[in-house]
Interface confidence: low
Amino acid sequence: FERTRSLQDPCSNCPAGTFCDNNRNQICSPCPPNSFSSAGGQRTCDICRQCKGVFRTRKECSSTSNAECDCTPGFHCLGAGCSMCEQDCKQGQELTKKGCKDCCFGTFNDQKRGICRPWTNCSLDGKSVLVNGTKERDVVCGPSPADLSPGASSVTPPAPAREPGHSPQ
């Protein structure tokens, strides 16, 4: 009985972009300005997201889909659906509570976002360091020391002086 009733529900005929208006005898009414319904059979329309401040509009709201935001230059998106914008830093830096700071020795960041990370430890994979790491680049691992021809040298990266992202103590 329940299933039959739901199949006959007049609201199920209301397409996306409309809502089933109880105040008007369940007539399908268009979503008001700045609102949308992305599926049929909705009893209300959702308010469109507004991209303000550091957010900018990537896709305008329509009657059937919400607006999509991204971030103004110098910022990048975080979270599902770009729920937040965070300041960019340069490569070789990380964002701290005090702003952008250079990566500590033994760590790198090859992106404008995120944290400084420790150089790859080539020896864990039985390899040697072909190219030293920098603040902007990870070390490059090469063949294992045993695979190197006699007389060839390999560079071993020094241990990090301290780890990235320390809290101010």
Epitope: H76, C77, L78, G79, A80, E86, T96, K97, D110, Q111, R113, G114, I115, R117, P118, T120, R137, D138, E163, G165, H166, S167
Partner: antibody, heavy 116, light 111 residues
């Protein structure tokens, strides 16, 4: 829409290997590290390692060193996690998760069952 | 064994406030501001609720807040609602070879 879509459930025998994929969409694939985190039935979350999709560099938890390999294919915006020498205690849901300084986007999870 | 210690369970009535603790060491929670909290409903993937100790992603209710003192981080949920019932995990960056660690999880029951 930003999302991570993982491959389907797997059933493996002890000693075998499994390779799980995680396809990213809706953002710049090479701009964010990707991690793998697993969760055994009824248990907590366990970090396995990360891959830098930009360089291919990896960092694995000590527990998984020698058994796990993380790779990426930038042409398809996909990361892979291969775990070898499977044992029954590897039965778990395996999640990929995007990272900036926390895991802000997660895949839906891939159930891997190891059973003889 | 989880590296970060959380209570196995906490409970509260609707409208109340609860706090979940997450105790680590000077190698993880005590040294880094990269502490995050995740909510996980049964059969679902975890969801980020708090990052960088106390920052809340937009879309997450302001009833959720985070803090840290020494080696212990805390998640506080005020005005408990039925939908808050879930497992909660803390996580921190660490200086050990395991770069990220999780707590064992706390089951929150809304009475």
């Amino acid at each position: 829409e930003v999302q991570l879509v993982e491959s389907g459930a797997e059933v493996k025998k002890p000693g075998a290997s499994v390779k799980v994929s995680c396809k990213a969409s809706g953002y710049t694939f090479t701009g964010y590290y990707m991690h793998w985190v697993r969760q055994a039935p009824g248990q907590g979350l366990e970090w396995m390692g990360w891959i830098n999709p930009n360089s291919g560099g990896t960092n694995y938890a000590q527990k998984f060193q020698g058994r796990v390999t993380m790779t990426r294919d930038t042409s398809t915006s996909t990361v892979y996690m291969e775990l070898s020498s499977l044992r029954s205690e590897d039965t778990a849901v395996y999640y990929c998760a995007r990272d900036i300084r926390a895991f802000d986007i997660w895949g839906q999870g891939t159930m891997v069952t190891v059973s003889s | 064994q989880p590296v970060l210690t959380q209570p196995a369970s906490v409970s509260g009535s609707p409208g109340q406030s609860i706090t979940i603790s997450c105790t680590g060491t000077s190698s993880d929670v005590g040294s880094y501001n990269f502490v995050s909290w995740y909510q996980q409903h049964p059969g679902k993937a975890p969801k980020l609720m708090i990052y960088d100790v106390s920052n809340r992603p937009s879309g997450v209710s302001d009833r959720f807040s985070g803090s840290k003192s020494g080696n212990t981080a805390s998640l506080t949920i005020s005005g408990l609602q039925a939908e808050d019932e879930a497992d909660y995990y803390c996580s921190s960056y660490t200086s050990s070879s395991t770069r990220w660690v999780f707590g064992g999880g706390t089951k929150l029951t809304v009475l």
